[in-house]
């Protein structure tokens, strides 16, 4: 690696992957092992992130970019840049301080993460429950009760295609 120096603005001359060494008359020196600088003109390099324990390496550290981590199977990322790993639960459960717990009646969770959410209240939209909710699935709302009078179909057929100048049959 060629150590470089600029007379006018020594540090701005140092590219990513190097640091501008105050102690060496501001020459550009390569980042030491397990460190990186993602921008030019840095006085020091930063220490590479280490993906340990429940974290696993998604992208290795290089002299110009930090390592990126994700989570081992059974865990999922939380926070910016996967700063934390949280335990997965099954669908129909949520993570509490005491571990994974089933969703209470009237709530559901269709993912391995997050909290149990209340079933949709179909009546608020003037609709009825078409399919009951479970711990893993939300209710499915159908047409309003008035639409379900005798003889009425619970599924509305598609409207026939109309051409300009023709009234519906």
């Amino acid at each position: 690696f060629e150590r470089t120096r600029s007379l006018q603005d020594p540090c701005s001359n140092c590219p990513a992957g190097t640091f501008c060494d105050n102690n060496r008359n501001q020459i550009c020196s390569p980042c030491p092992p397990n460190s990186f600088s993602s921008a030019g003109g840095q006085r020091t390099c930063d220490i590479c992130r280490q993906c340990k324990g429940v974290f696993r390496t998604r992208k290795e550290c290089s002299s110009t970019s930090n390592a990126e981590c994700d989570c081992t199977p059974g865990f999922h990322c939380l926070g910016a840049g996967c700063s934390m790993c949280e335990q997965d639960c099954k669908q129909g459960q949520e993570l509490t301080k005491k571990g994974c717990k089933d969703c209470c009646f009237g709530t559901f969770n269709d993912q391995k993460r997050g909290i149990c959410r209340p079933w949709t209240n179909c009546s608020l939209d003037g609709k009825s429950v078409l399919v009951n909710g479970t711990k893993e699935r939300d209710v499915v709302c159908g047409p309003s009760p008035a639409d379900l009078s005798p003889g009425a179909s619970s599924v509305t057929p598609p409207a026939p295609a109309r051409e300009p100048g023709h009234s519906p049959q």
Epitope: F19, D21, N22, N23, R24, S29, C31, P32, S35, R43, T44, C45, D46, I47
Partner: antibody
Framework: QVQLQQPGAELVRPGASVKLSCKAS????????INWVKQRPGQGLEWIGN????????NYNQKFKDKATLTVDKSSNTVYMQLNSPTSEDSAVYYC????????????????WGQGTSVTVSS | DIQMTQTTSALSASLGDRVTIGCRAS??????LYWYQQKPDGTVKLLIY???RLHSGVPSRFSGSGSGTDYSLTIRNLEQEDVATYFC?????????FGGGTKLEIK
């Protein structure tokens, strides 16, 4: 563990140069910068200069360019600072310190400090 | 040379208090700011490096923050052993320079 050993006190005659020592242990001596810092009684801290033991590269604060001379003895893991033509203004505690690892975020921080040598310039 | 200013030269606080000590630089330091603790017996220790990173062995009651020219050291749950003088130092460019120090006492 990292240690920087300095003598507790030195009494110096005005005009008679004195050489302060700083013996390092507990780490790879040649791989870290050693600084010298001055503190007058009841005052703040002043950086005098530093030296890299591996190749004896030095930097000096312009204010101390003619006052201090930094040298190293690799065989004994010791750094020296000679105070030239001392006057009463040079009566102070002198600390040697060690920088962090080259290139890392704490590189220019003084990670470890000696106990300091109290220098009294008096006839 | 970069001038480092600690406007408060002395402050007094009670045990358990939260204390903040400020430091201002005459130019942008790009976070190359360090904090030291000097005990009454003269012993000096590095507390914080690169603005906010805790040096090994330093209690988590100490924290640092700031950017550009303005930086601060915060001590939570003040303890008797925190009685000391606190100095900031810039490592942005030579010569390294220190603030004048802030002497912390217990009420």
């Amino acid at each position: 563990q990292v240690q920087l050993q300095q003598p507790g006190a030195e009494l110096v005659r005005p005009g008679a140069s004195v050489k302060l020592s700083c013996k390092a242990s507990g780490y790879t001596f040649t791989s870290y910068w050693i600084n010298w810092v001055k503190q007058r009684p009841g005052q703040g801290l002043e950086w005098i200069g530093n030296i890299y033991p591996s190749d004896s590269y030095t930097n000096y604060n312009q204010k101390f360019k003619d006052k201090a001379t930094l040298t190293v003895d690799k065989s004994s893991n010791t750094v020296y600072m000679q105070l030239n033509s001392p006057t009463s203004e040079d009566s102070a505690v002198y600390y040697c310190t060690r920088n962090g690892v080259e290139g890392y975020p704490h590189y220019y921080a003084m990670e470890y400090w000696g106990q300091g040598t109290s220098v009294t310039v008096s006839s | 040379d970069i001038q480092m200013t600690q406007t408060t030269s002395a402050l007094s606080a009670s045990l358990g208090d939260r204390v903040t000590i400020g430091c201002r630089a005459s130019q942008d330091l790009s976070n190359h700011l360090y904090w030291y603790q000097q005990k009454p017996d003269g012993t000096v220790k590095l507390l914080i490096y690169y603005t906010s990173r805790l040096h090994s062995g330093v209690p988590s009651r100490f924290s640092g923050s700031g950017s550009g020219t303005d930086y601060s050291l915060t001590i939570r749950n003040l303890e008797q052993e925190d009685v000391a003088t606190y100095f900031c130092q810039q490592g942005y460019t030579l010569p390294y320079t220190f603030g004048g120090g802030t002497k912390l006492e217990i009420k």
